[in-house]
């Protein structure tokens, strides 16, 4: 027997459409092989209809698409506009359509019920608005309208022109009769429910004279848009569900088990738990349509999504919606890496990005995930060099090591800087990921002075201790500035203003200016890394003042040990009041907002790495 | 909460036929928008499936059967009377099991043979083929 399994019998009616699922034991060979859908002619032939390859026959052009999902060990056959001509045996299968693995699909499309002569098809989504036309002569002008909707034999009254509503469409109903001279009456039903599908009349006058036009009021739940994301990566949804609720809340909501719809965000506040960190919901357009951006995405995100607009924030019968089944790869082209990364207060981490390799050249991106109301991520540094006043001196992205990876690197760390970050890029919006940075205890492993002021025209000697672990490691001491940190040139690349004296014997690695200039003034790290991974950082700002007693200056390597002067940098991070969320870039599809999905953790040189999921950025 | 409650159940012998009903009751939602199915557990061993029939809308549905069954079954349902039927024809003794009734509101997004995946179960119904 054929492994493939898949509907036995389907069966729809004319104009309708069907999805048919096959499934298949999701080997690799399986995985990437031709999928196929055909029919089964007299002559025991089967007759490719639509293929994984991209073939659709002339018969099926416009209205059939075959989709693989490998991971899953499905593919889908959807075919739309069905007609009686459907009807028939058909195969899908694996390989090749004569000797492949196959399943027998039987389909049977049949006439849709007969409507009355005359009839109007009124077409509309669930939570839509429909207004249905109901023509009278004169001399019934005067006389009674009504609406009646046609349940088997009987008709029971929905609305008339005598005030009357009927419960089921109670505060969502309204009759309307023109002025003198128009002969058309019109009937408006607001918030459509799937229960509102049928046959209609409706009625003006009574006995022989009385007018009669029938309409068939079709509700159509919305068909799932198939979504298929990487695992670590970003989704967006877009959801634009029309004027009349865009001063109404929105909501995201996923479908569960039950067939209720649990909230995963709404305008109003609430924000399921397990999206904390991973989860925006931008500003509304004029028009009333918004996005949900998940990053960082999970096997377990998978699941169809509605979003839709109701005053509770949360989905009801009758509001309009918009459908999403999402599908989560497995077989990520993002790479794994930590999605947490520790340090300690004082210290620094460094975390490493993904982005899309075949987009080097993109804009790169770091902003900090705020969870108050919908959600916000304001930008603290961008690869053009732009950091947010607050981060001075201790924030830099750097593009190594490239090929896929950037790195941002944040230190003088304190327990505000615990939180959620985004890495961003302005090209492929899907490798948005978010990282984690927990405060752990502990203390820096590189030490340095915490306040130096040198003096114009002199030496400056700034001193920065490593612990041991490091002596293996590549040590720098770097200036930064807006745009990164500008290694400075170390001894053997001969005399310069600026050099680095390393004594490794005294773990020591120094900073020499020499004549100290005003130019000098800033912020310098010192840093260890391995080739273009970087480890932990320490910073120091140095201010520089007019000469007042002769001889050189020399901060002592006692002095290093002391903690930084809490006067040279205001530690706290203050709230970033930043416009980054309204910026275009952080929700146009084509630009802004990655997911920093499983994150490269703080110390990479660091030797006590925690685990593949979490990274230590200083080790105690 | 649906409740399922199978019948339909009991002796026959090889050759012969049942057919068993499960009627749902205590949904808030629309009976078509549940896959309704149909699996069975021999003694000693494990419940496997025989059959489901899933509604996209009202007029379009989906019939699984399993292989070791198939063109002996026919799956239906009446919406009206919130209830599922199950034909079995030419029965053989290795059909001898307890047949369960099962429902889901998971729509079109699983395979239907896993049984993980149905949320509601009824208590069963015995059916005994004998030779």
């Known amino acids: 027997k054929s492994p493939v399994f898949g509907p036995q019998e389907v069966s729809s009616v004319e104009g309708n459409s069907v999805s048919i699922k096959c499934y298949y034991p999701p080997t690799s060979v399986n995985r990437h092989t031709r999928k196929y859908w055909c029919r089964k002619g007299a002559s025991g032939r089967c007759i490719t209809l639509v293929s994984s390859e991209g073939y659709v026959s002339s018969n099926y052009a416009g209205r059939a698409n075959l989709t693989n999902f490998p991971e899953n060990g499905t593919f889908v056959v959807n075919i739309a506009q069905l007609s009686r001509d459907d009807s028939g045996h058909y195969k899908c299968g694996l390989g090749i359509n004569s000797r492949g693995l196959s399943f027998d699909v039987s389909l049977e499309v049949s006439q849709g019920p007969e409507l009355p002569n005359g009839t109007e098809v009124y077409t509309v989504d669930v939570g839509r608005t429909v207004t249905i036309k109901c023509p009278f002569k004169t001399e019934n002008a005067p006389k009674t309208k009504a609406l009646y909707k046609k349940i088997g034999q009987t008709s029971v009254l929905v609305i008339d022109s005598r005030n009357y509503v009927n419960p089921n469409y109670k505060d969502r109903i309204r009759l309307r009769i023109p002025g003198t001279g128009q002969l058309i009456f019109t009937v408006v039903i607001d918030r459509l429910r799937l229960s509102d599908h049928g046959l209609y009349l409706c009625q003006a006058g009574d006995g022989s004279n009385r007018d009669e036009k029938n309409a068939d009021l079709q509700v159509l739940e919305p068909e799932p848009e198939l979504v298929y994301e990487d695992l670590r990566g970003s989704v967006t949804f877009h959801c634009a569900l029309g004027l009349e609720v865009a001063n109404v809340a929105k909501f995201l909501c996923r479908v569960n088990s039950r067939e209720t719809c649990d909230v995963v965000i709404n305008t109003l506040g609430k924000r399921d738990s397990a999206f904390e960190g991973r989860i925006l919901l931008n500003p509304q357009d004029k028009d009333g349509s918004f996005s949900v951006v998940i990053t960082g995405l999970r096997k377990e995100d998978e699941g169809r999504y509605l979003c839709g607009a109701h005053s509770d924030g949360q989905l009801q019968e009758g509001w309009p919606i918009q459908a999403w089944q999402l599908f989560v790869n497995e077989e990520s082209t993002i790479p794994r890496s930590p999605t947490v990364v520790k340090g300690v207060a004082g210290g620094s981490v460094a975390v490493l990005c993904p982005y899309n390799p075949k987009e080097s050249q993109s804009l790169k991106y770091w902003c900090l995930w705020e969870g108050a109301q919908n959600g916000r991520c304001p930008l603290l540094v961008e690869s053009q060099g732009l950091v947010q006043e607050q981060y001075e001196g201790r924030l830099s992205l750097l593009q190594e090591p490239g090929n896929g990876t950037f790195t941002v690197i944040l230190n003088q760390l304190t327990t505000q800087d615990a939180g959620f970050y985004w890495c961003l890029t302005n090209g492929d919006t899907r490798w948005r990921t978010t990282v984690e940075i927990k405060i752990i205890e502990g203390e820096p492993n590189l030490k340095v002075p915490g306040n130096v002021t040198a003096v114009l025209g002199e030496t400056l000697n700034i001193p920065c201790h490593f612990p041991c672990k490091f002596s293996s490691y590549e040590k720098y001491w770097c200036k930064w500035s807006n745009t990164g940190c500008q290694t400075l040139p170390s001894q053997d690349e001969g005399p310069s203003e600026a050099f680095v004296n390393c004594d490794e014997n005294s773990r020591l690695v120094s900073l020499t200016l020499n004549p100290v200039t005003r130019a000098d003034e800033g912020w310098y790290w010192c840093g260890v890394k391995q080739g273009h991974f970087y480890g932990e950082t320490a910073a120091v700002y140095v201010a520089v003042e007019e000469k007042k007693v002769a001889g050189s200056r020399y901060v002592s390597p006692a002095k290093a040990d002391a903690a930084p002067d809490e006067k040279v940098l205001d530690s706290g991070v203050r709230e970033i009041e930043n416009k980054a969320i309204q910026d275009p870039r952080l929700f146009a599809e084509e630009k802004v907002v990655a997911d920093t999905g499983d994150q490269a953790g703080g110390s990479r040189a660091s030797v006590d790495s925690s685990s593949s999921e979490e990274q230590g950025g200083s080790s105690k | 909460e649906v409740q399922l409650v199978e019948s339909g159940g009991g002796l026959v012998q090889a050759g012969g036929s049942l057919r068993l009903s499960c009627a749902a009751s205590g949904s808030g939602r629309t009976f078509t928008s549940y896959t309704m199915g149909w699996f069975r557990q021999a003694p000693g061993k494990e419940r496997e499936f025989v059959s489901a029939?899933?509604?996209?809308?009202?007029?379009?549905?989906?019939?699984y059967y399993a292989d070791s069954m198939k063109g002996r079954l026919t799956i239906s349902r009446d919406n009206a009377k919130n209830t599922v039927y199950l034909q079995m024809n030419s029965l053989k003794p290795e059909d001898t099991a307890v047949y369960y009734c099962?429902?889901?509101?998971?729509?079109?997004?699983?395979?239907?043979?896993?049984?993980?995946?149905?949320?509601?179960w009824g208590q069963g119904t015995q059916v005994t083929v004998s030779s």
């Open positions: 099962v429902a889901t509101g998971r729509g079109l997004t699983y395979d239907p043979r896993d049984r993980r995946k149905y949320d509601y």
């Open positions: 029939l899933t509604w996209a809308d009202d007029s379009t549905y989906y019939k």
